[in-house]
């Protein structure tokens, strides 16, 4: 709001000073030169003087302005300043300084801070097919890594695109060996909501971040295909007769979200027992993973059958495809 | 440059359309709302109509413009559009579309790409065992990812800890779909130098990087263990009789550097034919990888034996361990 000042028995309205800048193209690229346009508006007609500063140093004195235009009682004009892209990108601050009736009015600007700051990353994981379809307790995890420790706490908030309510979930912080902080928040979701295409958003704010980091997650689009499961046992080796390796190839599934489990004597083995590769594309259509499990003689002597099970949304009727293998077939 | 058009015997000069945007403050923070100002200048006076689009969708039709100002023969006006910060930060594209004398003129803009993109990273790879021991033409690769495109070039320089000279290697730049640049430099090394423990350094400098990125690489220390190789074929499936998948498990090797190849009829198949997982730790000591190869009926009918070969520094006598598999054993 403009105030009206009384000076030496003359009333006047001082200018509002606002810098606009040339915009990036529709690929988000900076132009080779940056134009700054200083809009000087809403002042009682009178002499003005414009000076442009770079990091507080005078760059352009008595910068020319076009004849002022008038709207009612008040005048407006503008001043332009052009600078090289490299100076703008090096985070220099530019000030448009307007002198009017013996007083200085100004506005300052610099390149907008990177909206996705380097180093700090946020990730949002989809629920596992096992949690979605079998245990019916799906969760999604928001993970923030590489934060510098500070007095201020990180704030993670969840929301849903549908606007439906989301419970408040406390985040857990963990200091890493390299001195950075990792922050995690786990949100329970409802299987039906996920299947119906709800979008979940995790928003991360912290005083040291130039702006919030926002990550969204919804179910994968695209065609669906059930996995094929094949399981193999390595042959006996002289030097390690009491240990064998089982390999499970799970392939041609779409989308890439899959849960892999091993069962022995009708009991699911702990996930830590086996190692699963990241889903990778097949040469045709779909993804594949391998899982590797080391088993002991004590286990196969108790029961010589191990099952590799894949849980996937396209597997029917019960989201499960599995295959059994014997370590010593025919014995 | 404005052109002059002749339409039904009337000459006119069409408008230049340029979007300016409200600037960030001197801390680089985005304002809560973003003002876009569409400058429509240098046209022969006449009716104009302004429409604002967001991601190609009409947002504001017949957007009001103040009375045109005239400079000589030509007129200028402007149109304003205000949007929420969150829409600007979500990388939507905004277009000012000006209709004049039955023709459309426009300018589009979006948030500028991050100039110091998150996670500018440099990686230095070790030479592959195949290149080191078999083809005897080892190289190491320095890879820089997630750079923002700019006029200035990235500078990658190589050096050796021994101080011995290093050839000048030109770097290659590739623009990625997400708008970032990937820069690669490949340095040939001498097998003997590598084996004897020479350290190689890649130094990356660029005006937009706050400081140089430096990466060093030397051969892995620690114990050595040769790989075990096991290879399996998936059984025939009714729906895909003319295609089978071969799986190769290579395990218990140390260090993790390994090359995997497939051979058929004594010929090495192109690397692009198969997919190898990243080395992962076994539960005991050592690493494992899987390789997956799809083979066709035409291939196995020509010769029904495929070989999976691992090249590793601990494999003796010739750095190679391999295993054969038949698709149709006993047929």
């Amino acid at each position: 709001v403009n105030k009206t000042f009384g000076v030496s028995s003359r009333n006047f309205t001082p200018p509002t000073v606002k810098i606009l800048q040339s915009s990036c193209d529709d690929d988000g690229h900076f132009p080779p030169t940056i134009q700054l346009l200083c809009l000087i508006s809403g002042y009682t007609p009178g002499a003005i003087n414009v000076t442009w500063l770079e990091n507080g140093q005078v760059m352009k004195v008595n910068s020319p302005t076009p004849p002022a235009t008038q709207e009612g009682e008040l005048a407006s004009t503008q001043s332009e300043f052009t600078l090289a892209q490299k100076h703008w990108l090096s985070d220099r601050t530019y000030t448009c300084q307007v002198t009017y009736q013996g007083t200085t009015y100004n506005d300052s600007t610099k390149k907008c801070a990177d909206s996705n700051p380097r180093g700090v990353s946020a990730y949002l994981s989809r629920p596992s097919p096992f949690d979605l379809f079998i245990s019916k307790s799906p969760t999604i995890t928001c993970l923030v890594v590489d934060l510098a420790p500070s007095k201020e706490t990180v704030n993670l908030t969840w929301s849903r695109a549908s606007g439906k309510p989301v419970p408040h979930i406390p985040a857990t912080e963990k200091k890493q060996r390299n001195g950075t902080l990792t922050v995690t928040s786990i949100l329970p979701v409802v299987t039906q909501d996920w299947i119906e295409g709800e979008t979940y958003q995790c928003r991360v704010t912290h005083p040291h971040l130039p702006r919030a980091l926002v990550r969204s997650m919804t179910k994968t689009s695209g065609p669906r295909a059930a996995p094929e499961v094949y399981v193999f046992a390595t042959p006996e080796k002289l030097e390690s007769r009491d240990k064998r390796t089982l390999a499970c190839l799970i392939q041609n599934f779409m989308p890439e979200d899959i849960s892999v489990q091993w069962l022995h004597s009708d009991v699911q083995l702990p996930d830590a027992r086996h190692s699963v590769t990241q889903p990778r594309k097949t040469k045709g259509s779909g993804f594949f993973v391998f899982s590797r499990l080391e088993v002991t003689k004590a286990e196969w002597e108790q029961k010589d059958e191990f099952i590799c099970r894949a849980v996937h949304e396209a597997a029917s009727p019960s989201w499960i495809v599995q295959q059994a293998v014997s370590v010593n077939p025919g014995k | 440059v404005n052109k002059t058009f002749g339409v039904s015997s009337r000459n006119f000069t069409p408008p230049t359309v340029k979007i300016l945007q409200s600037s960030c403050d001197d801390d680089g923070h985005f304002p809560p709302t973003i003002q876009l100002l569409c400058l429509i200048s240098g046209y022969t006076p006449g009716a104009i109509n302004v429409t604002w689009l967001e991601n190609g969708q009409v947002m504001k039709v017949n957007s009001p413009t103040p009375p045109a100002t005239q400079e000589g023969e030509l007129a200028s006006t402007q149109s304003e559009f205000t949007l929420a910060q969150k829409h600007w930060l979500s990388d939507r594209t905004y277009t000012c579309q000006v209709t004049y004398q039955g023709t459309t003129y426009n300018d589009s803009t979006k948030k500028c790409a991050d100039s110091n993109p998150r996670g500018v990273s440099a990686y230095l790879s070790r030479p592959s065992p195949f290149d080191l021991f078999i083809s005897k033409s080892p190289t190491i690769t320095c890879l820089v990812v997630d750079l923002a495109p700019s006029k200035e070039t990235v500078n990658l320089t190589w050096s050796r800890a021994s101080g011995k000279p290093v050839p000048h290697i030109p770097a290659t730049e590739k623009k990625q779909r997400n708008g970032t640049l990937t820069v690669t430099s490949i340095l040939p090394v001498v097998t003997q130098d590598w084996i004897e423990g020479e350290t190689y350094q890649c130094r990356v400098t660029h005006p937009h990087l706050p400081r140089a990125l430096v990466r060093s690489m030397t051969k892995t220390s620690g114990p050595r263990a040769a790989p075990e190789v096991y290879v399996f074929a998936t059984p025939e499936k009714l729906e895909s009789r003319d295609k089978r998948t071969l799986a190769c498990l290579i395990q218990n090797f140390m260090p993790e550097d390994i090359s995997v190849q497939w051979l058929h009829s004594d010929v090495q198949l192109p690397d692009a034919r198969h997919s190898v997982t990243q080395p992962r730790k076994t539960k005991g000591s050592g690493f494992f990888v899987f390789s997956r190869l799809e083979v066709t009926k035409a291939e196995w009918e020509q010769k029904d034996e495929f070989i999976c070969r691992a090249v590793h520094e601990a494999a003796s006598p010739s750095w190679i361990v391999q295993q054969a598999v038949s698709v149709n054993p006993g047929k």
Epitope: D27, G222, M254, K281, T282, G284, S285, G286, F287 | D91, K175, Q176, R177, N178, G179
Partner: nanobody, 122 residues
Amino acid sequence: EVQLVESGGGLVQPGGSLRLSCVASGFTFGSYDMSWVRQAPGKRPEWVSAINSGGGSTYYADSVKGRFTISRDNAKNTLYLQMNSLKPEDTAVYYCATDEDYALGPNEYDYYGQGTQVTVSS
């Protein structure tokens, strides 16, 4: 963020025509190859057609050759599939797809749209 939005599907009689569109955003559309993939109920996905980044090279599955035409308008960030002489076996959900690397043939793509249903029935 890469986004692909298909439209133009619907119910059509055998022998009829449809034109599918796919509007892309979030990437430099004109720099990337694009494909159409379809999935019939209870079947595995099937690659239909592809076009290179500039639009000069097109590729088709044998099942649609001579009936379907793929095209693109890079100025509008839009991919098209003109489907003529439609048959009941063309009934499927049609997806527009693209990939960071290879998108000119059967593949598992990095990005798909939500799909548009095409039903060919009398």
